[in-house]
Interface confidence: low
């Protein structure tokens, strides 16, 4: 008889922890280390968590060792430590800190938890913030203390000094925009508002301390940008106050941003500030939220998209059931990672339910938005009749859908730098998001989609996108589905004899490995954690050679490969090559500039997209109080001025030349 084919996927670790906590926090130490740390705890949303357990694996998840007994309070004290969180040093991957949820006590390790030292400290360490470069340096915050104290340690948590009180928020400065050891704090003032300070010597001297902004409602540091909101009281106005956004780019002094709108503004939410431009959700008093985009400085905002889905506790959507599950504001807005300028947003038309939700995508950083083209066929090969012209398109679940479907927690959109152009999402085809959900995959950065798996699934990928794995949600199962061709076809691997209830499917961040971890429970009545490690290296066979790669350029839904004024060429494994990229795969990228087209422009300040998205024209915004086209004052006869045509080149767009540049960039015209 023919020899049995060996399974291409192997379960090389199956650990039953005999632990019934309802949450698990998992951390891979990274940097090619085999260490994984797992904290089992009760949900922080429940009344005071009573217990916790900490487990460490030194063999990449094959086995786990319980180390909770090392987390004790020393001789004579028999009370049990309750660890709510642990912290990993970004500067030294061997170091961890475990903080007790109630006692003023923490434990530190310098050697991947082989040895742990406990220290009594002078505050309750609810929040620790470890420095990204200096491994001994960290800040600690005690939010339970009436004086809201901020502490500093420069010996990795062994000794502490208090550096500020009445602290609302704090953060380390960001390299290279701030000096080393810079701290930003937002301090509560008696007025009810805050003052934002910056210090380079932990507030030891006045000369190294600087006031950034006063009378602040909220403050946030995001890379090159600083954002703050201020409440402005309008004299002689029916509306008593309005909220202003203040912005700094490159650590320049903060200035008030300008928005073109007559509607009172309740709130601002920074949706994205990662590409030298800022996307802000502006929530109005009528519970409508619009998405605005700025130029690089982040000061002049133009309307990019109306009616974006945004939730805020006490604000937009807070009269819905979502308030029970979300205590932080969020927008249904996803930046497609690994590429520039591609974003997916959810539009909302009416109350917050899936019947009123539709997805849109932009390939030019919010210059133009379009609905997602539905796949032509189902995963079974049946034709899907869904035409954009009839209001039918593909809609992808984001944060709100997750919260509205708690029993079957929808997976978020998955896009990563490890596999540029590959996107996996849970969604549905139709007029809105309320239809049956399936898993959809795009290999083209969202330009085209295919239905990959019927029904909701957990999913992730490894080997830089070379292998995708998925497990069905909402049922006991022992089937791991996997694809080595970007979701075109799938195979099934039976990972355990008995079906288990799966809570998650993960791989080490960076998605370079071919090892996947399944978290679940195999007790019929009582939940008890089960961790399975699955190695899929053999499913990919051999290392890839040059012939297994192709050159790929992202394009928009019309096939235009010039995005943000340049064509980017990535080296990408051909979907049908069964081989692995390997941990150290370095994806070469070549960039070349293009001539300018309409896609390289967005609406200028004082203009907005025409209501008919398909026209893609910018028209004067009726809410703009200035005169969009009028010449400057004065405009002497005989001189010229640049008259806008309603467009401005997208920040970071590198196109040059072409007829469109001359047509859209405004013209020098004689003064009237």
């Amino acid at each position: 008889s023919a020899a049995l084919q060996p399974e291409p996927i192997k379960v090389y670790g199956q650990v039953s922890l005999n632990d019934s906590h309802n949450q698990m926090v998992v951390h891979w130490a990274g940097e090619k280390s085999n260490v994984i740390v797992a904290l089992a705890r009760d949900s922080l949303a429940l009344a005071r968590p009573k217990s916790s357990d900490v487990y460490v694996s030194y063999d990449y998840g094959k086995s786990f060792k319980k180390i909770s007994d090392k987390l004790n309070f020393g001789l004579g004290n028999r009370s049990e430590a309750v660890i709510a969180q642990f912290y990993h040093s970004p500067a030294d991957n061997k170091r961890y800190i475990f903080a007790d949820a109630y006692a003023q006590y923490l434990w530190i390790t310098f050697d991947f938890c082989n040895t742990l030292q406990g220290f009594s400290i002078p505050f309750r360490a609810a929040d620790l913030l470890l420095h990204s470069k200096a491994s001994n340096l960290l800040l600690g915050f005690d939010r339970s203390h009436p004086n809201k104290q901020l502490w500093k340690s420069d010996d990795f948590g062994q000794t502490w000094i208090m550096i500020q009180e009445h602290v609302k928020s704090f953060s380390w400065g960001i390299d290279p925009y701030d000096k080393p050891n810079t701290i930003y704090i937002e301090r509560h003032e008696p007025s009810g508002y805050s003052t934002v300070f910056r210090s380079t010597d932990f507030f030891q001297s006045r000369e190294n301390q600087e006031v950034i902004l006063e009378e602040v409602r909220d403050f946030q540091l995001r890379d090159k940008y600083m954002f703050a909101t201020k409440v402005v009281h309008l004299l002689g106005s029916e509306q008593q106050s309005s909220v202003q956004l203040w912005v700094s780019f490159g650590r320049k002094p903060m200035r008030a941003a300008q928005f073109v709108t007559r509607h009172p503004i309740n709130e601002y939410y920074i949706a994205d500030a990662s590409e030298d431009q800022v996307f802000v959700c502006v929530s109005h008093s009528n519970n409508r939220t619009n998405l605005y985009i700025s130029e690089a400085e982040g000061l002049k905002f133009s309307l990019s998209l109306e009616n974006v889905l945004y939730y805020s506790p006490g604000g937009a959507g807070s009269d819905t059931l979502v308030r029970y599950f979300a205590n932080e504001p969020f927008a249904d807005f996803h930046r497609v990672e690994g590429l520039q300028g591609v974003y997916i947003a959810t539009l909302i038309n009416g109350s917050m339910n899936e019947e009123n939700m539709r997805s849109v995508i932009t390939f030019d950083k919010g210059g133009t938005w379009e609905f997602l083209q539905a796949p032509a066929f189902t995963g079974y090969g049946e034709k899907i009749n869904c035409e954009l012209s009839q209001g039918c398109s593909l809609h992808l679940a984001q944060r709100l859908s997750q919260l509205l479907n708690l029993q079957l927690r929808r997976m978020p959109i998955l896009s990563k730098e490890s596999a540029p152009g590959l996107i996996i999402a849970t969604g549905s085809v139709g007029k809105n998001l309320a239809s049956k959900t399936n898993v959809y995959i795009s290999s083209s950065a969202g330009a085209r989609w295919r239905e990959a798996l019927p029904g909701p699934h957990y999913y992730t990928w490894g080997d830089h996108g070379g292998i995708i794995t998925a497990i069905a949600q909402g049922m006991e199962t022992n089937e791991l589905k996997y694809s080595t061709n970007e979701g075109e076809t799938w195979k099934t691997f039976i990972f355990s004899e008995k079906p288990v209830f799966v809570y998650g499917l993960l791989t080490e961040p960076g998605e370079k490995s071919t090892v996947f971890t399944i978290f679940g429970s195999n007790k019929e009545n009582v939940h008890s954690w089960l961790i399975l490690q699955v190695n899929a290296t053999d499913a990919l066979g051999v290392p890839c050679t040059e012939n297994d790669y192709k050159l790929w350029s992202p394009s928009d839904e019309r096939g235009n490969e010039c995005l943000l004024g340049h064509k980017t060429v990535f080296k990408r494994r051909t979907p049908h090559a069964t081989c692995f990229n390997g941990e150290d795969f370095d994806r070469p990228v070549v960039v070349s500039n293009c001539s300018c087209t309409r896609e390289d422009y967005e609406c200028d300040f004082g203009f907005k997209m025409s209501e008919d998205l398909s026209l893609e024209v910018c028209v004067p915004d009726p809410e703009f109080s200035g005169k969009s086209y009028s010449p400057p004052v004065p405009c002497p006869v005989g001189s010229t001025y640049r008259r806008t045509r309603g467009y401005r080149k997208i920040s970071g767009d590198t196109c040059s030349g072409g007829d469109v540049e001359a047509r859209l960039e405004g013209e020098l015209v004689p003064c009237p």
């Epitope: 090159k224 490159g250 030298d276 690089a296 400057p632 010229t640 640049r642 970071g652 590198t654």
Partner: antibody
């Protein structure tokens, strides 16, 4: 075409102040930042600061804070720089420059008693 | 502050031959938007500075294409392919990446 007109020379006494002008034409004054640059005799160029004519937002080189004050008058498309408490170290040619691509001819300031 | 370094004098060149002028910055001038903010100016005797090249290699309007610019990390070079008498003057490099903007000390082009 873009032009930046500056007066040729100013003679001032030590300790006094001087306010020099830079009249812009040929472009929309409020659309481009106006920079000021100092050049001492036989020396290189030194950036003093800049002003955004659309909202009078200024940014100074730390070295010139307290020494230079930048202002604009959008009605006449003119930028101004005032130098205070003048000493012989302030004797130099001062250029205005629109967005660092078009330059005025410079104003020569001589501080002498 | 970013320091820009230039040699005070160029090697003397003959009219019609090529010349190059170097400049070094104390910091990378590449912005995350992919643009390197290095500019070249020429100051002819008795005149104000004139922009020659912006963003390393782009010719300003009206500048003859005898001029070109290139970079290698933090080292920048201005090349003149066929030197003419009107090219005499002091050449300054400048960084416009960070405030305060800073200039090199200037390189005087000398003709044999």
């Amino acid at each position: 075409q873009v032009q930046l007109q500056q007066p040729g020379a100013e003679l001032v006494k030590p300790g006094a102040s001087v306010k020099m002008s830079c009249k812009a034409s040929g472009y929309t004054f409020t659309s481009y930042w106006m920079h000021w640059v100092k050049q001492r005799p036989g020396q290189g160029l030194e950036w003093i600061g800049t002003i955004d004519p659309s909202d009078s937002y200024t940014s100074y080189n730390q070295k010139f804070k307290g020494k230079a004050t930048l202002t604009v008058d959008t009605s006449s498309s003119t930028a101004y720089m005032q130098l205070s408490s003048l000493t012989s170290e302030d004797s130099a040619v001062y250029y205005c420059s629109s967005s660092m691509d078009y330059w005025g001819q410079g104003t020569s300031v001589t501080v002498s008693s | 502050d970013i320091v820009m370094t230039q040699a005070a004098f160029s090697n003397p060149v003959t009219l019609g031959t090529s010349a190059s002028i170097s400049c070094r910055s104390s910091k990378n001038l590449l912005h995350s938007n992919g643009i390197t903010y290095l500019y070249w100016y020429l100051q002819r005797p008795g005149q104000s500075p004139q922009l020659l090249i912006y963003r390393v290699s782009n010719l300003a309007s009206g500048v003859p294409n005898r001029f070109s610019g290139s970079e290698s990390g933090t080292d920048f070079t201005l090349r003149i392919s066929r030197v003419e008498a009107e090219d005499v003057g002091v050449y300054y490099c400048a960084q416009l990446l960070e405030l305060p903007y800073t200039f090199g000390g200037g390189t005087k082009l000398e003709i044999k």
